[in-house]
C-alpha cells in the first residue's frame, strides 16, 4: 500500500529524532501573566528533533514529502516534527465578571510525528 | 483568549512564508510505478515556506511554540509549515486479483498552517 510502516528507530542517534520533550514555562514567558491566574508554571510538552527519511511518518503525504525531499531537496522541504495529539489543560483565568475555568485542548502536545 | 488571530500577511516578502505549492511528480519519482496504474502523473500540493512569529498559527500550542522559540531558540524549534487539510485522490492500482480503485484521503495537501 502507499502507507508503509513508519520507522521508529532513530538513525541519527539517541534523542536526535522527532520526540516529545518537556519545556518548563512561566506565565511571564508566555505573556499570559495578566490574564491566567493558575497554574502559574506550565509543563509544556513540545515536539522537537529531526525527521530523517520515513521516520514516524504522519501519513502518506509525509512519506511522499520525504521521498521528494530526497530527490529535490531545494524544492521540497523535509517533513518536520509536530504534534500528533494533545493533552487537555485547564486554565483559571480572569474574565470581565470574575474568574473562570477553561479547558484548552490544543495547548500541550501528547505525541509527535513527522508531517 | 490564548488563541490569537493568525497573522496572514508574510513579513518576509511574497512567497517566503508557509503556503501551498504544486509539485509535479511521476509514479517513478514516488517509487509507485510498479503498483499504481493511474494517474501516472500526480499534482502533489505541498506545504512550503517559513513560519515567522505567529504567522498562520495552527492552534494555541503553535503560538506558545513561536513565543518560546523567540525566548529559547536553541531549545524550542520554530513552528513549521505542514498541511492543515487534505484533498482526496483516487488511485487505480494493481491487486492480486486484478485492478482496484482506492481513495487516499491523506495524500495531497489542500491547506497549510504553522504547527
Amino acid at each position: 500500500s502507499a502507507h508503509a510502516h513508519p520507522r521508529d528507530s532513530c538513525p541519527l542517534g539517541p534523542g536526535r529524532c522527532c520526540h516529545l520533550e518537556t519545556v518548563q514555562a512561566t506565565l511571564e514567558d508566555l505573556g499570559w501573566s495578566d490574564w491566567v491566574l493558575s497554574p502559574r508554571q506550565l509543563q509544556l510538552s513540545m515536539c522537537v528533533g529531526e525527521c530523517p527519511h520515513l521516520y514516524r511518518s504522519a501519513n502518506t503525504h509525509a512519506q511522499i514529502k520525504a521521498r521528494l525531499h530526497g530527490l529535490q531537496p531545494d524544492k521540497v522541504p523535509a517533513p518536520c516534527c509536530v504534534p500528533s495529539s494533545y493533552t487537555p489543560v485547564v486554565l483559571m483565568h480572569r474574565t470581565d465578571s470574575g474568574v473562570s475555568l477553561q479547558t484548552y485542548d490544543d495547548l500541550v502536545a501528547r505525541g509527535c510525528h513527522c508531517a | 483568549s490564548a488563541h490569537a488571530h493568525p497573522r496572514d500577511s508574510c513579513p518576509l516578502g511574497p512567497g517566503r512564508c508557509c503556503h501551498l505549492e504544486t509539485v509535479q511528480a511521476t509514479l517513478e519519482d514516488l517509487g509507485w510505478s510498479d503498483w499504481v496504474l493511474s494517474p501516472r502523473q500526480l499534482q502533489l500540493s505541498m506545504c512550503v515556506g517559513e513560519c515567522p512569529h505567529l504567522y498562520r498559527s495552527a492552534n494555541t500550542h503553535a503560538q506558545i511554540k513561536a513565543r518560546l522559540h523567540g525566548l529559547q531558540p536553541d531549545k524550542v524549534p520554530a513552528p513549521c509549515c505542514v498541511p492543515s487539510s487534505y484533498t482526496p485522490v483516487v488511485l487505480m492500482h494493481r491487486t492480486d486479483s486484478g485492478v482496484s480503485l482506492q481513495t487516499y484521503d491523506d495524500l495531497v495537501a489542500r491547506g497549510c498552517h504553522c504547527a
Epitope: - | 496504474l37 493511474s38 494517474p39 500540493s45 484533498t87 485522490v89 487516499y104
Partner: antibody, heavy 118, light 112 residues
C-alpha cells in the same frame, strides 16, 4: 451514487465565450479527475482537457490550447469549462466525465448543447 | 497524437448472436507496467457515453459479462458473446496512454 449534473443549453454568437458547469450531486468529486469531452452533431467524441486533484492545474488538448479553461471548485463540487472565441464548428454537446487520471471515465454528465450561430 | 481506427463503421447484428468490434492504434498502448491503456465506451441513442471496459480487458462495475475486451499493443477487440436488443448504440475505443486522449471514430451496432 454520484451524478454529474451539467448546466443548461446555450446559444452563443461567434466570437463570444461560453462557460459550462458540472456539479457532483449526491457527493463530491471524491478525488476523481474531471475530463471534458465534446461531440459535434452526428460526429464522434473529442477530448478537450482535464483536471486532477487538487484541481489546481488543467491539462488541455493542443487543439484547444489558449481557447479553453478548465477549473474546479472543490468547496461546491463544481467543475467548469470555458471556451472562448467561439465559431460555428464549436456547436456540439459538451460532456464532463469523472475518471482516474486519463482512464476509467465511469460517470458522465447529461451533456450541454452549445449552439454557435450568428 | 495517437490515432485510433475502428472497424467496421456499422455492424448489423442478430439478437443472441456474437459480435466483434476492432480497434487499432497508431502506436502501442502497452505501458511498461504491462497494462494496455485502452478503454471501450458505449453511447446508446440519446444518452451520454458509458464505460464498458478499461485498461484493455477490465470490465467496469455493473457491465454484463457478455462484454469482454482483449488485445495488446496496437490491436484490440471488443466482443459481445450474445447480443441483446439493449446493446444497440455507438461503441468507441479510447486511448488513455497519453494526452490528448483520443477516441476511435465509433462503430454503430444496430439490430438486423
Amino acid at each position: 451514487q454520484v451524478q454529474l449534473v451539467q448546466s443548461g443549453a446555450e446559444v452563443k454568437k461567434p466570437g463570444s465565450s461560453v462557460k459550462v458547469s458540472c456539479k457532483a450531486s449526491g457527493g463530491t468529486f471524491g478525488g476523481y479527475a474531471i475530463s471534458w469531452v465534446r461531440q459535434a452533431p452526428g460526429q464522434g467524441l473529442e477530448w478537450m482537457g482535464g483536471i486532477i486533484p487538487p484541481y489546481a492545474t488543467a491539462n488541455y488538448a493542443q487543439k484547444f490550447q489558449g481557447r479553453v479553461t478548465i477549473t474546479a471548485d472543490e468547496s461546491t463540487s463544481t467543475a467548469y469549462m470555458e471556451l472562448s472565441s467561439l465559431r460555428s464548428e464549436d456547436t456540439a454537446v459538451y460532456y464532463c466525465a469523472r475518471g482516474v487520471g486519463t482512464t476509467h471515465l465511469d460517470v458522465w454528465g447529461q451533456g450541454t448543447m452549445v449552439t454557435v450561430s450568428s | 497524437d495517437i490515432v485510433m481506427t475502428q472497424s467496421p463503421l456499422s455492424l448489423p447484428v442478430t439478437p443472441g448472436e456474437p459480435a466483434s468490434i476492432s480497434c487499432r492504434s497508431s502506436q502501442s498502448l502497452l505501458h511498461s507496467n504491462g497494462y494496455n491503456y485502452l478503454d471501450w465506451y458505449l453511447q446508446k441513442p440519446g444518452q451520454s457515453p458509458q464505460l464498458l471496459i478499461y485498461l484493455g480487458s477490465n470490465r467496469a462495475s455493473g457491465v454484463p459479462d457478455r462484454f469482454s475486451g482483449s488485445g495488446s499493443g496496437t490491436d484490440f477487440t471488443l466482443k459481445i458473446s450474445r447480443v441483446e436488443a439493449e446493446d444497440v448504440g455507438v461503441y468507441y475505443c479510447m486511448q488513455a496512454l497519453q494526452t490528448p486522449i483520443t477516441f476511435g471514430g465509433g462503430t454503430k451496432v444496430e439490430i438486423k
